[in-house]
Interface confidence: medium
């Protein structure tokens, strides 16, 4: 007992969907879990629309456990998941199915993460292995951003503006993060 367990750092970590038998006590009465935050931020309207509810970049709260190999965070973390469609969708006829289908008109707008926050988590490891500390990047807010035809999805612009505004006093964040850079994956806990 207490022997050093196999340390599986080199293996690829796959996020797993989990179902927890009972919610953690500290989050049991948290009414912000799994709900939209007032429909997100009301965006500026680059094209005319009568119904404001057509713009819906929603911030959904999800509680997750962080996992790394056989290890799992002692407590769940709560982060946002960006959901919804940005920009008014037009109902167009679908000749093949004789039904209706939604297609956004005009530029392509996406509801994507806007700001991130870093959180340090302690991972508990089974079999007598020492706990691990990990820093994870969690989504802090969502925003509608514009995707022009000249850019791929990593080159997103702010909703309603022609160019992305550089944030004052901040170093530019690298756009892409490799899987290895973020070793600790997030595991759904609902």
């Amino acid at each position: 007992q207490g022997w050093q367990a196999f340390k599986n750092d080199a293996t690829e970590i796959i996020p797993e969907l989990g179902e927890y038998p009972e919610p953690p006590p500290e989050l049991e009465n948290n009414k912000t879990m799994n709900r939209a935050e007032n429909g997100g931020r009301p965006p500026h309207h680059p094209f005319e629309t009568k119904d404001v509810s057509e713009y819906s970049c929603r911030e959904l709260h999800f509680t997750r456990y962080v996992t790394d190999g056989p290890c799992r965070s002692a407590k769940p973390v709560t982060e946002l998941v960006c959901s919804g469609q940005c920009g008014p969708a037009r109902l167009l006829p679908n000749a093949i199915g004789r039904g209706k289908w939604w297609r956004p008109s005009g530029p392509d707008f996406r509801c994507i993460p806007d700001r991130y926050r870093a959180q340090r988590v302690q991972l508990l490891c089974p079999g007598g292995e020492a706990p691990r500390a990990r820093k994870v990047r969690l989504v802090a807010s969502c925003k509608c951003k514009r995707l022009t035809r000249f850019h791929n999805q990593s080159e997103l612009k702010d909703f309603g503006t022609e160019a992305a505004r550089p944030q004052k006093g901040r170093k530019p964040r690298p756009r892409a993060r490799s899987a290895k850079a973020n070793q600790a994956e997030l595991e759904n806990a609902y």
């Epitope: 179902e19 927890y20 038998p21 009972e22 056989p70 079999g127 595991e187 806990a189």
Partner: nanobody, 120 residues
Framework: EVQLVESGGGLVQPGGSLRLSCAAS????????MGWYRQAPGKQRELVAT???????NYADSVKGRFTISRDNAKNTVYLQMNSLKPEDTAVYYC??????????????WGQGTQVTVSS
């Protein structure tokens, strides 16, 4: 007191299959991890596979694609389906149960072990 009882070990030919079971009895907290470890003669105990009460699984590289860990939360039982067995899988297989309460380890239990021998 928690007890872990393993079963299903035995002698099998290379390429064959075995299914190990580990039943936990006693007062067990719902937030837990169950796993299988093995120890070959003259070697250190090593992780084979683990599964959390959430269903999150992890496997040692040497058994990926051949072994499958599963559990029945209602019965507090964990299973290890071992396919395409190789002579190097020969070892004593131990069941482990760790439970978490308010963010810290509450307990760490081990079974007595079951012998798996892969030989022609």
């Amino acid at each position: 007191e928690v007890q872990l009882v393993e079963s299903g070990g035995g002698l099998v030919q290379p390429g064959g299959s075995l299914r190990l079971s580990c039943a936990a009895s006693g007062s067990i907290f719902s937030d837990n991890v169950m796993g299988w470890y093995r120890q070959a003669p003259g070697k250190q105990r090593e992780l084979v596979a683990t599964i959390w009460s959430s269903g999150h699984t992890n496997y040692a590289d040497s058994v990926k694609g051949r072994f499958t860990i599963s559990r029945d939360n209602a019965k507090n039982t964990v299973y290890l389906q071992m396919n395409s067995l190789k002579p190097e899988d020969t070892a004593v297989y131990y069941c482990n149960l760790g439970t978490i309460v308010t963010g810290t380890w509450r307990s760490d239990y081990w079974g007595q072990g079951t012998q798996v021998t892969v030989s022609s």
